[in-house]
Amino acid sequence: MEDTKESNVKTFCSKNILAILGFSSIIAVIALLAVGLTQNKALPENIKYGIVLDAGSSHTSLYIYKWPAEKENDTGVVHQVEECRVKGPGISKYVQKVNEIGIYLTDCMERAREVIPRSQHQETPVYLGATAGMRLLRMESEELADRVLDVVERSLSNYPFDFQGARIITGQEEGAYGWITINYLLGKFSQKTRWFSIVPYETNNQETFGALDLGGASTQITFVPQNQTTESPDNALQFRLYGKDYNVYTHSFLCYGKDQALWQKLAKDIQVASNEILRDPCFHPGYKKVVNVSDLYKTPCTKRFEMTLPFQQFEIQGIGNYQQCHQSVLELFNTSYCPYSQCAFNGIFLPPLQGDFGAFSAFYFVMNFLNLTSEKVSQEKVTEMMKKFCSQPWEEIKTSYAGVKEKYLSEYCFSGTYILSLLLQGYHFTADSWEHIHFIGKIQGSDAGWTLGYMLNLTNMIPAEQPLSTPLSHSTYVFLMVLFSLVLVIVAIIGLLIFHKPSYFWKDMV
């Protein structure tokens, strides 16, 4: 009787334990499958594309972006797949030859046709944003600016893409979209903290980077200042991105891009020239170039220096002296007048600089050419290198950089000097804060610049609120997979023990 009772108990217990083990294994397997499948949904990858044309003052560039459709609102999923530089000058130079605009855009638009799958053409948006070169043309004549844009629109409408229009963006937009671009690419809008960083400039904190953009006709500075209140509402922007509020300062200095700054400097210096020879410290010794006075006064940027000269042309003769060039450049910045607590120059409000800055576009191109983009190069070293570079004879420079177009090559001394002057005297960076400037060309394969931010905004890909994230973070996913795998392993071991050594397992159960 006792034996029967004992065997019944054993049978009951073993059945229950087997049932529990079986149930646990099934749960673990289901959990593993569920977690695995939820996390790694085998959806057909639906890729979307977007095209933005940056119609700058000196040239036009076409950028193609792609992103997975399912992750449209995620941060950091859009990346650049192609950049095509249009051959020729900026669109504002086509005012006398608008009939050539169609041909001008052909190569890059055809390249876009090749890169983007044909099935996607009709749903790929195309945006063209024109910047300071066209702002200057519009300042001279709205009719001429309209005419250029009309022809551009007609040309772009002939392609199979979803053309969304061509417009002149404001300086504020240019600054803001550049700021959005670099912070998006640096992962600053992501609310998840990372255990490791794959972005070279990325600090683990979520503090945004400031943006320093230099073009041919304008320059922009945009950052989140420490003090939330602003003395100048014109320079204040409010964003809500991914559930967080940002109070941003931005200003665009029209005519202070590197090319227009050079025209300004020449117009200023020729005023005091005794004859038609301009000895210029911003060009290498031995460099010579003839400039038409009519070209000098063509731009509104030189209007304040305009005067009747006793000659139609003058010759620039380089003398290659960094210090004198620096002094000449400083005269472009009026720092004598400031109606605010602090100004950049020309009476424009500038709050105290805060945090790290990404300096891109021509800031990067020029400093990269001069080999001065390294984080380790101090401001003093940069100045030293510039002194050395500017004093090199023109013939020597031409030999050393035989592959570089002379027009560009001749201007690196001025451009480098101008960048230093703008950053130090214009924006008030110091030798100490210089290390907070990071000269950036690309971030994870995407060019730093306003175009990505512009497209993200126009395609509504930056939500105001933090979107519902993927079902699990990577760490939670790994943890759950390990946990359920362990459960399965333990269940398997216990099962083996039960069936191989049952007496050992039951011996104390009476």
Epitope: Q96, E143, R147
Partner: antibody
Framework: QVQLVQSGAEVKKPGASVKVSCKAS????????MHWVRQAPGQRLEWIGY????????TFSQKFQGRATITVDTSASTAYMELSSLRSEDTAVYYC?????????WGQGTLVTVSS | DIVMTQSPDSLAVSLGERATINCRAS??????????MYWYQQKPGQPPKLLIY???NQGSGVPDRFSGSGSGTDFTLTISSLQAEDVAVYYC?????????FGGGTKVEIK
């Protein structure tokens, strides 16, 4: 929306100077030139000159060269037109107008009366 | 200076009828394929209002009954069907070169 608001009417004696202001809003002040145009009673519109607010450079009609001065205060988004050595024939409504070559936006006008 | 000559000096048109104003420039006001010719409407006590720019483009908010044509030196403003609110003085202007000049004006009234 773009708005240009001018200062009030002025009465001046011959030989004196007058300074009319034009406060702009609704756009980036330094992105467009500011022109000044006047209209004497029953007369055609007459262009005085313009300023590039970006840098303060200005251009005038030969008729007003040396007598008219146009200035700006970019921090206040305001343009000013000063006319000196006033004579009775300067009695007119003075307008500011925004534009490069297209005067799409005008101030409401400021009546300047020159009378002894 | 480019002289702008408007004709007629005044014009009386019945409501719903067509009104045509001409403007002749002393030299071509075309440049880079654009006519730097503008038409403005001015009512008593008000600043001028831009009607037509670039000779033939309508200003924003301008009724379709206003149209402009011409190039070079000869230009026309047409009001296809005159309305009571169109009673005003109309001016042409060139901005091809400094000094920018205006026509003498055409007074439009209802017959």
């Amino acid at each position: 929306q773009v708005q240009l608001v001018q200062s009030g009417a002025e009465v001046k004696k011959p030989g004196a100077s007058v300074k009319v202001s034009c406060k702009a809003s609704g756009y980036t002040f330094t992105d467009y030139n500011m022109h000044w145009v006047r209209q004497a009673p029953g007369q055609r519109l007459e262009w005085i000159g313009y300023i590039v607010p970006l840098n303060g450079g200005s251009t005038f009609s030969q008729k007003f060269q040396g007598r008219a001065t146009i200035t700006v205060d970019t921090s206040a988004s305001t343009a000013y037109m000063e006319l000196s050595s006033l004579r009775s024939e300067d009695t007119a409504v003075y307008y500011c107008a925004r534009g490069g070559t297209r005067f799409a936006y005008w101030g409401q006008g400021t009546l300047v009366t020159v009378s002894s | 200076d480019i002289v702008m000559t408007q004709s007629p000096d005044s014009l009386a048109v019945s409501l719903g009828e067509r009104a045509t104003i001409n403007c002749r420039a002393s030299e071509s006001v075309d440049n880079f394929g654009v006519s730097f010719m503008y038409w403005y409407q001015q009512k008593p006590g008000q600043p001028p209002k831009l009607l037509i720019y670039g000779a033939s483009n309508q200003g924003s908010g301008v009724p379709d009954r206003f149209s402009g044509s011409g190039s070079g030196t000869d230009f026309t403003l047409t009001i296809s069907s005159l309305q009571a609110e169109d009673v005003a003085v109309y001016y042409c202007q060139q901005t091809k070169e400094v000094p920018y000049t205006f026509g003498g004006g055409t007074k439009v009234e209802i017959k």
